[in-house]
């Protein structure tokens, strides 16, 4: 279905195959201020009580081609003494993202949208739900 | 320049504006197995030592239209007794994702790629780097 009625300023496209054939400008627009981006620390992975590592996942037929994925370093969390705490678990926070995959493979101009589940970082959880008092 | 020599199976497109004008099939393919998707727990946000909430961010001129963003519940982390630990900070793990924005606004068939920084969850960090021993 067409999501929004077309106005005269919109390029024409067949409504019934709208979802299968949209035009996209892949020149990335940085809607983040460079200040916001530079303020975002990348050292949490070492300083966290549930530290993680990042591995490089590259697929030249995907946009973005390179995605860095998190893996938790330990099964347990690290306590204040730097020891593993066997009552607390280090778990991966995952996010579902959309990527573009070339279709057919190696064709530079046509893509399909695909969902991908990526690890973003780790957090420390207890086996019992607790609330701060 | 055309990135890959076009074969007859590839739809034609003008090489010199490759990035500005690609065709995308927006029918999302779920490349995640339903098992992988269903295994992904959503209760980490309550069980974490750095719990978070999720807020709904909706923009009809964006694809995906709805994005859930995390915010840390506390500035500090929650200890084993359920109290806030003033030596540990709860910090937001952010990820840069790509979204499609309608261009011009409200046109159903043309999009541009935009970067968006989203909060995915929270983790507990110390002010000193510690390593598990």
């Amino acid at each position: 279905a067409v999501l929004i009625p077309q106005s005269s300023v919109c390029p024409n496209a067949e409504a019934n195959n709208f979802l299968q054939n949209v035009k996209v400008n892949l020149k990335v627009i940085n809607s983040l201020s460079s200040k916001a981006s530079s303020r975002r620390p990348s050292d949490y992975l070492n300083r966290s009580t549930s530290p993680w590592t990042l591995s490089r996942n590259e697929d030249p037929d995907r946009y973005p081609s390179v995605i860095w994925e998190a893996q938790c370093r330990h099964q347990r969390c690290v306590n204040a003494e730097g020891k593993l705490d066997h009552h607390m678990n280090s778990v991966l926070i995952q996010q579902e993202i959309l990527v573009l995959k070339r279709e057919p493979e190696k064709c530079p101009f046509t893509f399909r949208v695909e969902k991908m589940l990526v690890g973003v970082g780790c957090t420390c959880v207890s086996s019992i739900v607790r609330h701060a008092s | 320049a055309v990135l890959i020599p076009q074969s007859s199976v590839c739809p034609n497109a003008e090489a010199n504006n490759f990035l500005q004008n690609v065709k995308v099939n927006l029918k999302v393919i779920n490349s995640l197995s339903s098992k992988a998707s269903s295994r992904r727990p959503s209760d980490y946000l309550n069980r974490s030592t750095s719990p978070w909430t999720l807020s709904r961010n909706e923009d009809p001129d964006r694809y995906p239209s709805v994005i859930w963003e995390a915010q840390c519940r506390h500035q500090r982390c929650v200890n084993a007794e359920g109290k806030l630990d003033h030596h540990m900070n709860s910090v937001l793990i952010q990820q840069e994702i790509l979204v499609l924005k309608r261009e011009p606004e409200k046109c159903p068939f043309t999009f541009r790629v935009e970067k968006m920084l989203v909060g995915v969850g929270c983790t507990c960090v110390s002010s000193i780097v510690r390593h598990a021993s």
Epitope: L26, V28 | L19
Partner: antibody, heavy 121, light 106 residues
Amino acid sequence: EVQLVQSGAEVKKPGSSVKVSCKASGYTFTDYEIHWVRQAPGQGLEWIGVNDPESGGTFYNQKFDGRATLTADKSTSTAYMELSSLRSEDTAVYYCTRYYRYESFYGMDYWGQGTTVTVSS
Amino acid sequence: DIQLTQSPSSLSASVGDRVTITCSASSSISYIYWFQQKPGKSPKRWIYATFELASGVPSRFSGSGSGTDYTLTISSLQPEDFATYYCHQRSSYPWTFGQGTKLEIK
């Protein structure tokens, strides 16, 4: 104009460390990874590893794992390569080069001018 | 590790000659990249994704190949083409380069 400007030449003793910087300008620093490549005198090119300024991720050629440390400072758009436990075989020109994260077909498109590191007792 | 073997290692040719440099990979790779380097200078990206000429590279250069065998061809050698050319793969870690082909004036 895209530029990768590296720090000056270094002379180091065996067993010591060296830290080479690579200051980027003319583009969005976090859209590109920084790869490091070295070239010993009269020899070919050797890939050391990659740092992603956006996430802080690093990946190394196993040959350098444990000795090389790649970092980046987003606030100054500067990448760093530190090499420890230097030996005479590490005498080389060290290059930084950028690599577009979104569309990897382009490969390593811009290179720094190189930093000569000489290891000698 | 994927080994890239360039041949010849060095080549003497005259202005106007047609020159072909080959790069053979020890395993199949998806794309090859070529860099040009002149003495005392940084490498320059010359051909990317096997076929594509980098910005400013003259059309007398071309790239081809697939699988394990790739070539860089110069249809009519010019004085400014005398340099060392390296092939490079990034299909498998660690990323590797060929040993280089030095193109000299005869």
